[in-house]
């Protein structure tokens, strides 16, 4: 059985389209499961992995490896 584009698995009922945009940064494995690109995490791979040591409470990042501080906090790790 050959599945349609972006469909995987037994019965071709698993859908996965690789994407690299605001809504996700991932490839699809042979079973149609998302595999996040380096630097991204979460079920949709749309959450950037911040700089190692970045304060989870006072820092955040839009892009991997970044660490943006909340107002009132500073430093490399916003701590």
């Amino acid at each position: 059985v050959t599945c349609d584009d972006y469909y995987y698995g037994f019965g071709c009922n698993k859908f996965c389209r690789p994407r690299d945009d605001f809504f996700g940064h991932y490839a699809c494995d042979q079973n149609g499961n998302k595999t996040c690109m380096e630097g991204w995490m979460g079920p949709e791979c749309n959450r950037a992995i911040c700089r190692q040591g970045c304060s989870p409470k006072h820092g955040s990042c839009k892009l991997p490896g970044d660490c943006r501080c909340q107002y009132g906090w500073q430093g490399l790790y916003c701590d």
């Epitope: 349609d4 584009d5 972006y6 859908f15 996965c16 389209r17 945009d21 605001f22 809504f23 979460g42 079920p43 949709e44 749309n46 959450r47 950037a48 911040c50 955040s60 990042c61 839009k62 892009l63 943006r68």
Partner: antibody, heavy 119, light 107 residues
Framework: QVQLVQSGAELKKPGSSVKVSCKAS????????MHWVRQAPGQGLEWMGA????????AYNQKFKGRVTLTADKSTSTAYMELSSLRSEDTAVYYC????????????WGQGTLVTVSS | DIQMTQSPSSLSASVGDRVTITCRAS??????LAWYQQKPGKAPKLLIY???TLADAVPSRFSGSGSGTDYTLTISSLQPEDFATYYC?????????FGGGTKLEIK
């Protein structure tokens, strides 16, 4: 279970701004972007934009660029949509909505917030 | 931006009828299409995603088909609770636009 609870109805003057809130529960807030969709009375649905609460990244419908601002507060799992320079055509029900799992589109919706713009 | 053209805009039918609503995208959306049902005063409810997959707890009388730019929602045997407005929506690339809607009324 996933729940999205929005703030109450608003009556606004033309030229002013409105800020609608959407409190999320039942899932990890930072795992999914929050989208905003509006519906004018008797009209269809219009996607306004989305925010990734984890890092604050945003995507906007160009139609609203410059007038709409999406923000999120991770500490309270609340997303906000602020629309400025209001005009009568902005009278609509505003919905926050979230994708489901495994690439669903909008599986979860808030109850909607009616914003009326009138002088 | 990809535009979605939905037809018909309104439709009268009877309980038990088979009904088809179509949606055409201005570009290839690769099955990234959803169908919603909306009743007055309520938020839309997801029926079908990825063109043909039924959302949770949606009755099997609803089905979706299509590929490329042309997609169809079919209700095999209308029930009284199916009279509502139906919207298609693509989610291939931002902005994620909706069709204009199809109001399904009782004949």
């Amino acid at each position: 279970q996933v729940q999205l609870v929005q703030s109450g109805a608003e009556l606004k003057k033309p030229g002013s701004s409105v800020k609608v809130s959407c409190k999320a529960s039942g899932y990890t807030f930072t795992d999914y972007e929050m989208h905003w969709v509006r519906q004018a009375p008797g009209q269809g649905l219009e996607w306004m934009g989305a925010i990734q609460p984890g890092g604050g990244g945003t995507a906007y419908n160009q139609k609203f660029k410059g007038r709409v601002t999406l923000t999120a507060d991770k500490s309270t799992s609340t997303a906000y949509m602020e629309l400025s320079s209001l005009r009568s055509e902005d009278t609509a029900v505003y919905y926050c909505t979230r994708r489901g799992y495994d690439d669903y589109p909008f599986a979860y919706w808030g109850q909607g917030t009616l914003v009326t713009v009138s002088s | 931006d990809i535009q979605m053209t939905q037809s018909p805009s309104s439709l009268s039918a009877s309980v038990g009828d088979r009904v088809t609503i179509t949606c055409r995208a201005s570009g290839n959306i690769h099955n990234y299409l959803a169908w919603y049902q909306q009743k007055p005063g309520k938020a839309p409810k997801l029926l079908i995603y990825n063109a043909k997959t039924l959302a949770d707890a949606v009755p099997s009388r609803f089905s979706g088909s299509g590929s490329g730019t042309d997609y169809t929602l079919t209700i095999s045997s209308l029930q009284p609770e199916d009279f509502a407005t139906y919207y298609c929506q693509h989610f291939w690339s931002a902005p994620w636009t909706f069709g204009g809607g199809t109001k399904l009324e009782i004949k």
